[in-house]
């Protein structure tokens, strides 16, 4: 089940998915002046079985100005991931995200890709938030958001993160990149009488205004 909305935005914060659930799609987009090769994939798809997940298809871009006689070949995502994890593996790296059951890691760059990547997330996807450079977490609970299905509708949980200017006192001076966990923290969702938040109002408005598949874009 695809998530209908974008993850929530937080002032002076940025989010990333550290690993992508099976079923996630990534559009194959090229930057200006380039286009997908003829017969090239429209998207990459995170697929797999219980023991291993990887991106199906590969994105390839070629110059719009030239005839498509020679393909610009980009290594298979699987091949790239292999290179990433075996060539001088850093001892300080967290557990390889690809080892999470049912998850793919961030696909490596491909030549002349678009600046923004457009992902289609699925229910259960988690994204992690950090304050951008120059800002610090002043007060926070879980700094992540999970796409959940509640009463037949998808919604993203609200991350508890406030980012403030560097000069102000920070209760959380040390922030580290979280290791992706397969599922979000369990939340009590036994009742349908959920308090309506600003975020819920915004997402419900967005959902009613949406006429086509909602795409999630981030750099």
């Amino acid at each position: 089940e695809l998530c209908d909305d974008d993850p929530p935005e937080i002032p002076h914060a940025t989010f990333k998915a550290m690993a992508y659930k099976e079923g996630t799609m990534l559009n194959c987009e090229c930057k200006r002046g380039f286009r997908r090769i003829k017969s090239g994939s429209l998207y990459m798809l995170c697929t797999g079985n219980s023991s291993h997940s990887s991106w199906d298809n590969q994105c390839q871009c070629t110059s719009s100005a030239t005839r498509n006689t020679t393909k610009q070949v980009t290594p298979q995502p699987e091949e790239q991931k292999e290179r990433k994890t075996t060539e001088m593996q850093s001892p300080m790296q967290p557990v390889d995200q690809a080892s999470l059951p049912g998850h793919c890691r961030e696909p490596p760059p491909w030549e002349n890709e678009a600046t923004e990547r457009i992902y289609h997330f699925v229910v259960g996807q988690m994204v992690y938030y950090q304050c951008v450079q120059g800002y610090r977490a002043l007060h926070r609970g879980p700094a992540e958001s999970v796409c959940k299905m509640t009463h037949g509708k998808t919604r993203w949980t609200q991350p508890q993160l406030i980012c403030t200017g560097e000069m102000e006192t920070s209760q959380f001076p040390g922030e580290e990149k979280p290791q992706a966990s397969p599922e979000g923290r369990p939340e009590s969702e036994t009742s349908c009488l959920v308090t309506t938040t600003d975020f819920q109002i915004q997402t419900e408005m967005a959902a009613t205004m949406e006429t086509s598949i909602f795409t999630t874009e981030y750099q």
Partner: nanobody, 130 residues
């Protein structure tokens, strides 16, 4: 195939300078943080510096602040690390790396410090003799 190619390493005396280059032809720099890690023999790899392709914000590990400067020439698909006043403790293999930016082109230095990058170069050796 998209690769990161480092150059500029070598042997230099303490107090000297070197400029490392990392070329990534075909990389859409605007979507990435690009920069340098280093690994000294028997030590963990550490994130030295990066520059973001979205707004050119920079980061440096404390031990190189004021001595190293990162810059970019995206027209040449290249990022540079100017290293001045080198010390013996800067001796290491220096690796170029890229990491995808977060939403709205934002980036957090903790992501770089984690060392979980999307693509690595093969490295260039820098040796500083005393």
């Amino acid at each position: 195939q998209l690769q990161l190619v480092e150059s500029g390493g070598g042997l230099v005396q303490a107090g000297g300078s070197l400029r490392l280059s990392c070329t990534a032809s075909g990389l859409t720099f605007e979507g990435y943080a690009i920069g340098w890690f280093r690994q000294a023999p028997g030590k963990e790899r550490e994130g030295v510096s990066y520059i973001t392709g979205s707004d050119a914000s920079t980061y440096y590990i404390d031990s190189v602040k004021g001595r190293f400067t990162i810059s970019s020439d995206f027209a040449k698909s290249t990022v540079y690390l100017q290293m001045n006043n080198l010390k013996p403790e800067d001796t290491a293999v220096y690796y170029c790396a890229v990491d995808r930016l977060g939403s709205r082109g934002g980036y957090a230095s903790s992501w770089w410090r984690s060392g979980d990058m999307d693509l690595w170069g093969k490295g260039t050796l820098v040796t500083v003799s005393s």
